[in-house]
Amino acid sequence: VPRWRQQWSGPGTTKRFPETVLARCVKYTEIHPEMRHVDCQSVWDAFKGAFISKHPCNITEEDYQPLMKLGTQTVPCNKILLWSRIKDLAHQFTQVQRDMFTLEDTLLGYLADDLTWCGEFNTSKINYQSCPDWRKDCSNNPVSVFWKTVSRRFAEAACDVVHVMLNGSRSKIFDKNSTFGSVEVHNLQPEKVQTLEAWVIHGGREDSRDLCQDPTIKELESIISKRNIQFSCKNIYRPDKFLQCVKNPEDSSCTSEI
């Protein structure tokens, strides 16, 4: 008789999740000499321990503490790039500008990027059929709690000038409900962070509006200012040219506004 299984609204665990976490960990620690001491077997065991045999709507930040400890990593606190709804461009940027880091350039972010996972209460099985959806099922699910935990820690570590890339093509350029808006903004430390600089990325070729005047950006400025952190904003009118100029800053066309 097949066991009854809870049916959630979200997609199930990414296929070959354990192998993917292990392989990414091994590769990451090889590439990053400062993480060569990390035992990826222990990392996987800690990752697994955070959600296996636990109800997938009952996950806490505490569950992830052993993993957080193993993945402790020092990134230059003044070289942090946050992003919201524009992950691909942010990652392209840090691939070129190697001294800047998104969360997904750290071990823990790299391990979990684009993956889904959950378990089942009282069984050691991984649920490959379905996992809780943040809206339709519950917010304290393994994936959401993981990203909330690592995002909070990442923001807390930031100092000096922190950059954030925002998607100017969206109706809400700054969304209070995004991870950036709900977690990272509120965990920047005013005693360490002097300025949050927003880069608003334009989508349309002919879009010459000043999106730094957008009401949601003004809302972000207000939240940041109330936290005693300065705010600045730049329009990136041509993201393709922006990336090109990061690659080749000496190019003559890179002196004009991008």
Epitope: R16, T20, A23, C25, E30, P33, R36, Q41
Partner: antibody
Framework: QVQLVQSGAEVKKPGSSVKVSCKAS????????INWVRQAPGQGLEWMGR????????YYAQKFQGRVTITADESTSTAYMELSSLRSEDTAVYYC??????????WGQGTLVTVSS | EIVMTQSPATLSVSPGERATLSCRAS??????LAWYQQKPGQAPRLLIY???TRATGIPARFSGSGSGTEFTLTISSLQSEDFAVYYC?????????FGQGTKVEIK
């Protein structure tokens, strides 16, 4: 329980190739690095290279670059090491070793490859 | 590549005595160093990683220390099964490299 079982001893002629297999038991074969380390008679250990099967990602020691090919068959949890243009100095015991970091926690029993005319 | 040099080449010790094996790296390898034991006709066995962490199932008489370029493996009281060849290995820089080994023999 993790076990790595290697293929049997081989005798090869100079200039030929040898392909040694390493079958793994235990979970998540594809996520670990499978390394190849050799040991000439009465000599020390020499790391040759490794593969991460899931990523199809290989890395070879410069000394063996162009002469060694490491592959993996995920369906059978087996890794292979092929060494070409064999010479007498390649006579050695060849070990596969599984790692989840830079150190080697599990080793195969070794395969003796003798290169002789 | 990083050259690992072990000394002495051979160490003669009586059972019950302490054995101290040295390993020197040609440049700093931080604490990214492992020790292995190998007996004749067998594959190496992992003893220590991270310069000082004992691998699963390794007796407490084996201990590792050091960082940077100088490392030591200590066997506090040699048992008959400890007579073997010991290798150090660095995993700080590609390619991973081993020392030439120290043979611990019965005095």
């Amino acid at each position: 329980q993790v076990q790595l079982v290697q293929s049997g001893a081989e005798v090869k002629k100079p200039g030929s190739s040898v392909k040694v297999s390493c079958k793994a038991s235990g979970d998540f074969f594809s996520g670990y690095a499978i390394n190849w380390v050799r040991q000439a008679p009465g000599q020390g250990l020499e790391w040759m290279g490794r593969i991460i099967p899931l990523l199809g990602d290989t890395y070879y020691a410069q000394k063996f670059q162009g002469r060694v090919t490491i592959t993996a068959d995920e369906s059978t949890s087996t890794a292979y090491m092929e060494l070409s243009s064999l010479r007498s100095e390649d006579t050695a015991v060849y070990y596969c070793a599984r790692s989840a970091a830079g150190w080697f926690a599990y080793w195969g029993q070794g395969t003796l490859v003798t290169v002789s005319s | 590549e990083i050259v690992m040099t072990q000394s002495p080449a051979t160490l003669s010790v009586s059972p019950g005595e302490r054995a101290t094996l040295s390993c020197r790296a040609s440049q700093s390898v931080s604490s990214n160093l492992a020790w292995y034991q190998q007996k004749p006709g067998q594959a190496p066995r992992l003893l220590i990683y991270g310069a000082s962490t004992r691998a699963t199932g390794i007796p407490a008489r084996f201990s590792g220390s050091g960082s940077g370029t100088e490392f030591t493996l200590t066997i506090s009281s040699l048992q008959s099964e400890d007579f073997a060849v010991y290798y150090c290995q660095q995993y700080n820089n590609w390619p991973w490299t081993f020392g030439q080994g120290t043979k611990v023999e019965i005095k």
